[in-house]
């Protein structure tokens, strides 16, 4: 049984809480890396691929060394929500063209959702200010062609990979300061 009603909950160990978030982030990063390798193998596409609807890479928000935990978690959650939306859009819009990647894309979506829930939990446990609900984002336009969709897939996975690296580096750095 839990503590008696009215007794204060044991305060969480912030390092342990942060650590489990880092682990989920690293696991998702590895999934993303493997999927990116598969995508490049099956649908080679040279050069950088951009998608205007994707979040600006968090890295440009400032040097990692100067970041604080609330700003990292807030920014990460906002960016990952956007990537979740883009992965869902990609699976809907490109179902047939990307069917060779489908089981992995589905797993990626599930794990992205799990990390988002973990971030939400971490923010509440560390008593960080909760964000207001996101306003509904405008729907993403379907890709103009199969090739356009493949380029979008490269942009989404590439951006997610870099965002997760930024997150792992930032969270581990912050953990050393706790």
């Amino acid at each position: 049984p839990g503590p008696p009603p009215g007794s204060p909950r044991a305060s969480p160990d912030p390092r342990a809480e942060l650590d489990s978030t880092v682990l989920l982030t690293r696991s998702l990063l590895e999934d993303t890396r493997q999927l990116t390798i598969q995508l490049k193998d099956k649908f080679p596409a040279d050069g950088d691929h951009n998608l205007d609807s994707l979040p600006t890479l968090a890295m440009s928000a400032g040097a990692l060394g100067a970041l604080q935990l609330p700003s990292v978690l807030t920014r990460l959650r906002a960016d990952l929500l956007s990537y979740l939306r883009h992965v869902q859009w990609l699976r809907r819009a490109m179902g047939s063209s990307l069917k060779t990647l489908e089981p992995e894309l589905g797993t990626l979506q599930t794990r992205l959702d799990r990390l988002l829930r973990r971030l939400q939990l971490l923010m509440s446990r560390l008593a960080l200010p909760q964000l207001p609900p996101d306003p509904p984002a405008p729907p993403l336009a379907p890709p103009s062609s199969t090739w356009g969709g493949i380029r979008a897939a490269h942009a989404i996975l590439g951006g997610l990979h870099l965002t997760l690296d930024w997150a792992v580096r930032g969270l581990l750095l912050l953990k050393t300061r706790l």
Epitope: S27, L57, M59, L64, G65, H161, D165, R169
Partner: antibody, heavy 119, light 111 residues
Framework: EVQLVQSGAEVKKPGASVKISCKAS????????MDWVKQAPGQRLEWIGD????????IYNQKFTGRATLTVDKSASTAYMELSSLRSEDTAVYYC????????????WGQGTTVTVSS | DIVLTQSPASLALSPGERATLSCRAS??????????IHWYQQKPGQAPRLLIY???NLASGVPARFSGSGSGTDFTLTISSLEEEDFATYYC?????????FGQGTKLEIK
Amino acid sequence: EVQLVQSGAEVKKPGASVKISCKASGYTFTDYNMDWVKQAPGQRLEWIGDINPHGGGPIYNQKFTGRATLTVDKSASTAYMELSSLRSEDTAVYYCARGELGHWYFDVWGQGTTVTVSS
Amino acid sequence: DIVLTQSPASLALSPGERATLSCRASKSVSTSGYSYIHWYQQKPGQAPRLLIYLASNLASGVPARFSGSGSGTDFTLTISSLEEEDFATYYCQHSRDLPPTFGQGTKLEIK
């Protein structure tokens, strides 16, 4: 062929600074982090820090914070490490190494740059 | 910081023999399916070369006689049948937390 080519050996006086370059070729520079590792005679390898060429600034081993500065020139696929306020303990071989995103294992290394600090 | 201790400090074996090198971490470097330990080989005057990453994955171009195993705090690099070119110093490294740290090395010498 994937390779990292570092600048040549340096001899410096105590208190001076040194800046080492590391030119990457054979891969997409922004797909990996660039890490720097120190190997002093008779000492363990020591991680100095890393930088993601996409931006956002480097992260450092606390031991080197304030003295090491990592930068990149994305257009030239080149990374730099500057070490200031040199002392005799900084005499070592310094390596740049390509780091897998989020994992800190180093699959490609530069040939090393020997820095000697002596009065 | 996590401290990695390698043993033995040096090992003398003959070509064709099996080599077993050990690396012990001061705290667990394994979590949820991953062990954040990596192995390198270094020869005099050369840069280190990645052999094994994430405890058991063979790096590109590394011969299959090299293998890595272990979890938690205890890890092993095994060379199944030593070749002349395998005599070198071997380092383990962790990436569980920041900063990544290296072991002090095991020197493998020809008997």
